[in-house]
Interface confidence: low
């Protein structure tokens, strides 16, 4: 005779387990039916009666066969910066994902807990790494010979047009302006856009070469006269020679004058000094800054004032995005304990017209015994953007999300706690602050 099929509830054979979609009730000591997804156990089984299941109440769910006394609550409604990709039903939780132009700053097992707007690179900066569903845009200064004149989360640095005769030299935020003859480009013209509906599979290309550590001048001359455009005539050698000559002479005079002044003022052998003019800060912001004579400029302890955004976040969900800790403006604590000077100004309060800050960095390098020859001077002045947000180091770090750290820029933060830093290189000379604007 075939073995009789046992109907729930039944006492299992010694050493055997209950069947699929059944559970062992310790009280009744019987195998009882589980409730199907979308239901929960209203009445637990006894020796004589099976589990009584009931449908989940509104806004609750169970995704698995279960014997829970209450269904799980669906997550709260998706926020305005999110899209509901899966609705709350009796069998599934709501899933919220970030809408286009935003990325997930704090993910959870399914969907996103917190979205943040993709950073926009301001003029003079291009996209080094595009944003994805889970990472922000990384901006970088445009290298010599390239520029970006837009505030965008997709535009990369584009090459300057190459002129036969330069009317206005290009810089990091402006293309070269040519005189009336037709220009040529080292690459295809037009703004280069990265794909905007960001995807986790987007390629992290490096569209432009990394900026060199060599100082870049604010007047970029063409490498040499390019051959005249086909069909055009005229002798360009003379004006180009004049421009080059006059510029070189001017530079030489400035350099000589500068070194003479320095030798008169300082009277130091082998002048190799760096001066950083730090903008006047209120007392509370100036704490921790040290004199310009020190080798390590501006060192402060990292701020630990930011509150935990969600202390109840599970260990699985505590994946923080690649952002740095909020610290005193202009300071970045690095792993090796060294400091990086920054010219980033702090954000202005929402709706306000924050103070603009001029930061000038003058670097003098003299390497001769009589202190007057072989001198070069470099000055770069940047106007701090009143609404620039903290800049991002291109390094892709995973920062643990503790109570002392802020995973993203939220409205809980005051502008004063936000960090500004240029790059992972110790003060690239002549490179303005790596300013980014939030969307």
């Amino acid at each position: 005779l075939p073995a009789q099929v046992a109907f729930t509830p039944y006492a299992p054979e010694p050493g055997s387990t209950c069947r699929l979609r059944e559970y062992y009730d310790q009280t009744a000591q019987m195998c009882c039916s589980k409730c199907s997804p979308g239901q929960h156990a209203k009445v637990f089984c006894t020796k004589t009666s099976d589990t009584v299941c009931d449908s989940c109440e509104d806004s609750t769910y169970t995704q698995l066969w279960n014997w829970v006394p209450e269904c799980l609550s669906c997550g709260s409604r998706c926020s305005s910066d999110q899209v509901e990709t899966q609705a709350c039903t009796r069998e599934q939780n709501r899933i919220c994902t970030c809408r286009p132009g935003w990325y997930c700053a704090l993910s959870k097992q399914e969907g996103c807990r917190l979205c943040a707007p993709l950073r926009k690179c301001r003029p003079g900066f291009g996209v080094a790494r595009p944003g994805t569903e889970t990472s922000d845009v990384v901006c970088k200064p445009c290298a010599p010979g390239t520029f970006s004149n837009t505030t965008s989360s997709t535009d990369i640095c584009r090459p300057h047009q190459i002129c036969n005769v330069v009317a206005i030299p290009g810089n990091a935020s402006m293309d070269a302006v040519c005189t009336s003859t037709s220009p040529t480009r080292s690459m295809a013209p037009g703004a280069v856009h990265l794909p905007q509906p960001v995807s986790t599979r987007s390629q992290h290309t490096q569209p432009t070469p990394e900026p060199s550590t060599a100082p870049s001048t604010s007047f970029l001359l063409p490498m040499g006269p390019s051959p005249p455009a086909e069909g055009s005539t005229g002798d360009f050698a003379l004006p180009v020679g004049l421009i080059v000559g006059v510029t070189a002479l001017g530079l030489l005079i400035i350099g000589v004058v500068n070194c003479v002044i320095m030798t008169q003022v300082k009277k130091k052998p082998l002048c190799l000094q760096r001066e950083a003019k730090v903008p006047h800060l209120p007392a509370d912001k100036a704490r921790g800054t040290q004199g310009p004579e020190q080798q390590h400029l501006l060192i402060t302890a990292p701020s630990s004032s930011s509150s935990s955004l969600e202390s109840s976040a599970s260990a699985l969900d505590r994946r923080a995005p690649t952002r740095n800790q909020p610290q005193a403006p202009g300071v970045e604590a690095s792993g090796a304990g060294e400091a990086r000077a920054s010219t980033g100004s702090s954000d202005s309060s929402p709706g306000g017209h924050g103070t603009q800050v001029n930061v000038t960095c003058i670097v003098n390098v003299c390497s001769s015994s009589d202190h007057s020859s072989q001198c070069s001077s470099q000055a770069s002045s940047t106007m701090g953007d009143t609404d620039s947000s903290p800049s991002e180091s291109p390094k892709d770090e995973q920062v643990p999300f503790s109570k002392e750290e802020c995973a993203f820029r939220s409205q809980l933060e005051t502008p004063e706690t936000l960090l500004g830093s240029t790059e992972e290189k110790p003060l690239p000379l002549g490179v303005p602050d790596a300013g980014m604007k939030p969307s």
């Epitope: 509104d58 806004s59 069998e91």
Partner: antibody
């Protein structure tokens, strides 16, 4: 006595936009889910969409882009963007029993008498 | 997604007889199913919700059963007044569905 009343149904030519309005009496419409259902002559019931008390809206897959549901504090509107002859039907405004699911309701417990929309050239 | 199929499309029943109408969901809808009665020239009227709960004022000769994907409406001791078209409707989700309603079953009372 709780009642629902639809208005705005009329004879229109194809391509004409039309707005139907649902008004409640005896209860506050704003605390309930409100669905629009239509019925072509001699055919079955066809669900168009629902607006929840919190303002979220769900449409039938075929109705997306063809109809827009909106609400004020006292009425719920159904706007048809560009009607065709196939949209000729009686349009019912229906109350969904309060439930706080984002995507559903328990039952449609109160129906209006319906308003006839005829689309003909 | 969540298509509702009603059978039969039409049924004839004698007064005092019993009629059974079936409704099948293409996916599980737990017990979130309602039944409506619609008489000619009138709007539909709620009979049963949550598969088996009788709406107020509905005679006890109407009963509903089922869970998951298979549901049944039974009218016992059919009266002349029961001649109507009956619709099932899933109340499980309104997300990404074509129609909440089944195609309807016409009940003709002889």
């Amino acid at each position: 006595q709780e009642q629902l009343k639809e208005s705005g149904g009329r004879l229109v030519t194809p391509g004409t936009p039309l707005t139907l309005t649902c008004t409640a009496s005896g209860f506050s419409l704003s605390s309930y889910y409100v669905s629009w259902v239509r019925q072509a002559p001699g055919k079955g019931l066809e669900w168009i969409g629902i607006i929840h008390s919190d303002g979220s809206i769900y449409y039938a897959t075929w109705a997306k882009g063809l109809f827009t549901i909106s609400r004020t504090s006292t009425t719920v509107d159904l706007k048809a963007t560009s009607l065709t002859t196939e949209d000729t039907a009686t349009y019912f405004c229906v109350r969904g029993y309060p439930g706080y699911y984002t995507s559903t309701f328990n039952r449609l417990d109160l129906w209006g008498q319906g308003t006839l929309v005829t689309v003909s050239s | 997604a969540y298509d509702m199929t009603q059978t039969p499309a039409s049924v004839e029943v004698a007064v005092g007889g019993t009629v059974t109408i079936k409704c099948q969901a293409s996916q599980t809808i737990s017990n979130e199913l309602s039944w409506y009665q619609q008489k000619s020239g009138q709007p539909p009227k709620l009979l049963i919700y949550r598969a088996s709960t009788l709406a107020s004022g509905v005679p006890s000769r109407f009963s509903g059963s089922g869970s998951g994907t298979e549901f049944t409406l039974t009218i016992s001791g059919v009266e002349c007044d029961d001649a109507a078209t009956y619709y099932c409707q899933q109340g499980y989700t309104t997300n990404n569905v074509d129609n909440l309603f089944g195609g309807g079953t016409e009940v003709v009372v002889k």
